[in-house]
């Protein structure tokens, strides 16, 4: 195991000004032991609402790299392979938890952060607003 | 703030048998301050690959509630509102980080865990395997 250095500038479990502090074992347990890592790797190309993946990188965050989906078209791909603007490609978003060092440069003190990521795109019927 | 009870059955930062233990502040910082909470709330109904949301609840996990998508159909909804089985509804999956109480029921001791969640569904062209 490791011993956590008592750096005076870094919080510890007795610090009443460091609210809701818990201890976390960073040995990640993987619950998805039988999943195929290539599971949905080509959906971004085969979808009627295809998307590109963009790298969002921040070395001070864990995970440092997050892949963000951006829909390729405003419309959706029809049976002829053309973009149909009567339908809309929209991103499916999810809030995920990430870790961030806080205060920065303290090796064993982190803060949970929620960020919104676009995971992929889906094709939806547009909401039509009728002018009265 | 809170004080962390010294429950003898729960590990603390000096416990050499609790590897890679760090302090994490659970006062979650939300980077998505300007996002609309209803952002994609009705996509599951309007999509050509609609899905149902199932509540996955586990009091020993943080977050304790995760909403899982299950595609409603094998095929996709066509312009006539019927299911077209020449296309496939497939789940878009993502691995996310969660915290799990470890040992169970210890209020301030967790382990990082990776789980695979289905966020929504998209409509894809099927892969056709030709028989030789």
């Amino acid at each position: 195991g490791i011993t956590i250095p008592r750096n005076p500038g870094c919080p510890n479990s007795e610090d009443k000004n460091f609210p809701r502090t818990v201890m976390v074992n960073l040995n990640i347990h993987n619950r998805n032991t039988n999943t195929n890592p290539k599971r949905s790797s080509d959906y971004y190309n085969r979808s009627t609402s295809p998307w590109n993946l963009h790298r969002n990188e921040d070395p001070e965050r864990y995970p440092s790299v997050i892949w963000e989906a951006q829909c390729r078209h405003l419309g959706c791909i029809n049976a002829d392979g053309n973009v149909d603007y009567h339908m809309n490609s929209v991103p499916i978003q999810q809030e995920i938890l990430v870790l961030r060092r806080e205060p920065p440069h303290c090796p064993n003190s982190f803060r949970l952060e929620k960020i919104l990521v676009s995971v992929g795109c889906t094709c939806v019927t547009p909401i039509v607003h009728h002018v009265q | 703030g809170i004080t962390i009870p010294r429950n003898p059955g729960c590990p603390n930062s000096e416990d050499k048998n609790f590897p890679r233990t760090v302090m994490v502040n659970l006062n979650i910082h939300n980077r998505n301050t300007n996002t609309n909470p209803k952002r994609s709330s009705d996509y599951y109904n309007r999509s050509t690959s609609p899905w149902n949301l199932h509540r996955n609840e586990d009091p020993e996990r943080y977050p304790s509630v995760i909403w899982e998508a299950q595609c409603r159909h094998l095929g996709c909804i066509n312009a006539d509102g019927n299911v077209d089985y020449h296309m496939n509804s497939v789940p878009i999956q993502q691995e996310i980080l969660v915290l799990r109480r470890e040992p169970p029921h210890c209020p301030n001791s967790f382990r990082l865990e990776k789980i695979l969640v289905s966020v929504g569904c998209t409509c894809v062209t099927p892969i056709v395997h030709h028989v030789q």
Epitope: L26, N27, I28, P37, K38, S41, D42, Y44, N45, W51, N52, L53, R55, E57, P59, Y62, P63, S64, V65, I66, W67, R101, H105, P107 | P19, R20, E95, L97, K114
Partner: antibody, heavy 124, light 109 residues
Framework: QVQLQQSGPGLVKPSQTLSLTCAIS??????????WGWIRQSPSRGLEWLGR?????????DYAVSVKSRITINPDTSKNQFSLQLNSVTPEDTAVYYC??????????????WGQGTLVTVSS | EIVLTQSPATLSLSPGERATLSCRAS???????LAWYQQKPGQAPRLLIY???NRATGIPARFSGSGSGTDFTLTISSLEPEDFAVYYC??????????FGQGTKVEIK
């Protein structure tokens, strides 16, 4: 099981281009869960990462600052291989060159499969 | 660029003894992106540990890793004859920052 097989000349003249190829079996160069990289090793520099390619709806190329102006890594999807080109070589580029698979889940990063290594000598 | 400094440069031990190898980073790195490799003469490096403490497939339990922040350790609990080799740590900070330590040679005393 995944294997990497390297090929290419062991002797290159100064100012010329070093070219090596790495053939992949048991995995795909366009896999979305891996990146494919080149690493070299010399007594003076130790192990030095040179660069990688990875495919995520398009090809991403990442190169070490030390060689950025001289390096190109290209995929060949038809042959399921990738190549290294290092231009304007000098005797300082003499090293054993390795290709490797970098496991590229966002949660971990490490090289789990390595090629056999190719000793490249830069000399006239 | 993050510099990884390994110590000692050489470790002279007998079979059955415990080996403790250190890897110190010039700035904080995520433990999840810290790996250890073993290299024998004329061979490519072989992955031992990833994520600072996870044993790679097929690696014996006598190898263990620990640490976080800037200080990481590889421990071989009881040296076997085949463990005498050079050991390297490696970090990934960003897509353009990936570095190796200079290595620790574990030799037979």
């Amino acid at each position: 099981q995944v294997q990497l097989q390297q090929s290419g000349p062991g002797l290159v003249k100064p100012s010329q281009t070093l070219s090596l190829t790495c053939a992949i079996s048991g995995d795909s160069v366009s896999s979305s869960s891996a990146a494919w990289g080149w690493i070299r090793q010399s007594p003076s520099r130790g192990l030095e990462w040179l660069g990688r390619i990875s495919y995520r709806s398009k090809w991403y190329n990442d190169y070490a600052v030390s060689v950025k102006s001289r390096i190109t890594i290209n995929p060949d999807t038809s042959k399921n291989q990738f190549s290294l080109q290092l231009n304007s070589v000098t005797p300082e580029d003499t090293a054993v060159y390795y290709c490797a698979r970098e496991v590229d889940s966002i949660y971990y990063s490490y090289f789990d499969i390595w090629g056999q290594g190719t000793l490249v000598t830069v000399s006239s | 660029e993050i510099v990884l400094t390994q110590s000692p440069a050489t470790l002279s031990l007998s079979p059955g003894e415990r080996a403790t190898l250190s890897c110190r980073a010039s700035q904080n790195v995520w433990a999840f992106y810290l790996a250890w490799y073993q290299q024998k003469p004329g061979q490519a490096p072989r992955l031992l540990i990833y994520g600072a403490s996870n044993r790679a497939t097929g690696i014996p339990a006598r190898f263990s890793g620990s640490g976080s922040g800037t200080d990481f350790t590889l421990t071989i609990s009881s040296l076997e004859p085949e463990d005498f080799a050079v050991y390297y740590c490696q970090q990934y900070r960003s897509t353009l920052s990936l570095t190796f330590g200079q290595g620790t040679k574990v030799e037979i005393k």
